[in-house]
């Protein structure tokens, strides 16, 4: 699998999409996990509804939400109030029993907000009561890493 880069702006929402063959993964729940190290395990962040027929319902874990269009074959993950610590490698997965198929490998990059000149202490963090439905979702910038490309070029 190639890695697809999704870039979002700090403090805003980032939408990650993972297309898949809807028939190949028919009846399969999906998950979004964070890769722990290059060869480490992928730690589950959030998964779709326990009942596959209800996969279209949004499920959330903290600031991350997931929804699955099982007919169209698109898994969508929304990372709300994007923070620098959200940057890293992730996977979209299709689940069956104890097994997980990788649908897409994702690198999330968090960009500083060019319009935000406030101190970090003044950053607005939304309250738990605010729903994902109200969240403003920016269109994410995505591209695939080229063969052999270093995801985080060394800084001088």
């Amino acid at each position: 699998h190639n890695t697809t880069v999704f870039q979002g702006v700090e403090g805003q929402s980032l939408q990650v999409s993972c297309p898949y063959d809807s028939m190949k993964h028919w009846g399969r729940r999906k998950a979004w996990c964070r890769q722990l190290g290059e060869k480490g395990p992928c730690q589950r962040v959030v998964s779709t509804h326990n009942l596959w027929l209800l996969s279209f319902l949004r499920r959330r874990n903290g600031s991350t939400a997931i929804t699955d269009d099982t007919l169209g074959g698109t898994l969508t993950i929304t990372l709300r109030n994007l923070q620098p610590h959200d940057a890293g490698f992730y996977q979209c997965q299709s689940l069956h029993g104890s097994e997980a198929d990788t649908l897409r490998k994702v690198l999330v990059e968090v960009l500083a907000d060019p319009l935000d000149h406030r101190d970090a202490g003044d950053l607005w963090v939304p309250g738990e009561s605010e729903s994902f439905e109200d969240a403003h979702v920016e269109h994410s910038i995505s591209r695939s890493l080229l063969e052999g490309e270093i995801p985080f070029p060394p800084t001088s």
Epitope: H25, W26, G27, R28, H96
Partner: antibody, heavy 121, light 107 residues
Framework: EVQLVQSGAEVKKPGESLMISCKGS????????IGWVRQMPGKGLEWMGI????????RYSPSFQGQVTISADKSISTAYLQWSSLKASDTAMYFC??????????????WGQGTLVTVSS | EIVMTQSPATLSVSPGERATLSCRAS??????LAWFQQKPGQAPRLLIY???TRATGIPARFSVSGSGTEFTLTISSLQSEDFAFYYC?????????FGPGTKVDIK
Amino acid sequence: EVQLVQSGAEVKKPGESLMISCKGSGYSFTNYWIGWVRQMPGKGLEWMGIIYPGDSDTRYSPSFQGQVTISADKSISTAYLQWSSLKASDTAMYFCARRRQGIWGDALDIWGQGTLVTVSS
Amino acid sequence: EIVMTQSPATLSVSPGERATLSCRASQSVSSNLAWFQQKPGQAPRLLIYGASTRATGIPARFSVSGSGTEFTLTISSLQSEDFAFYYCLQDNNWPPTFGPGTKVDIK
């Protein structure tokens, strides 16, 4: 009628190559995984591997990895099981089966009639 | 890989009697378990999938109980066409694995 029809019995010598086939009809062949199962004479069933003809994604059971090759040609709705160098221990009945996925679980619901492969010098 | 065991290896039953076949997994397979019937010279036939769902055309005399590691296939009243080999298959973990089978023969 939904069915899988396998190629006929084969008699081969050790070291020879062989490809047997499994043709699907009556359903969308590209949308279902096809599995291969071995049954040695007088023995039980052994899972060999599986292929998704839509994109040729193939998975092998560790016991059969490197021993056989599973492939498919979706244009003619046919899956294949291939050996590059047969051994006497490959003598068995080989079945292909369709895997249907669903919300209540997966099911090998349609089976081919089997292909008997005999390897003898 | 998960090892499946079936007992007994052979079950001798009279027609009309009840037959109880056991399938045990070396670790939990949740409900990802299927049962197949095979007669000599024929391909296997799907009976049960998802631990307890009967396949199309399978009569109600076939039922399964259990989940996790222990499953039981019950044939409530054996008919002449039920004398055959029965195999369980787990596909919770890769690779999927079959049990060694139980032969149900006429007493």
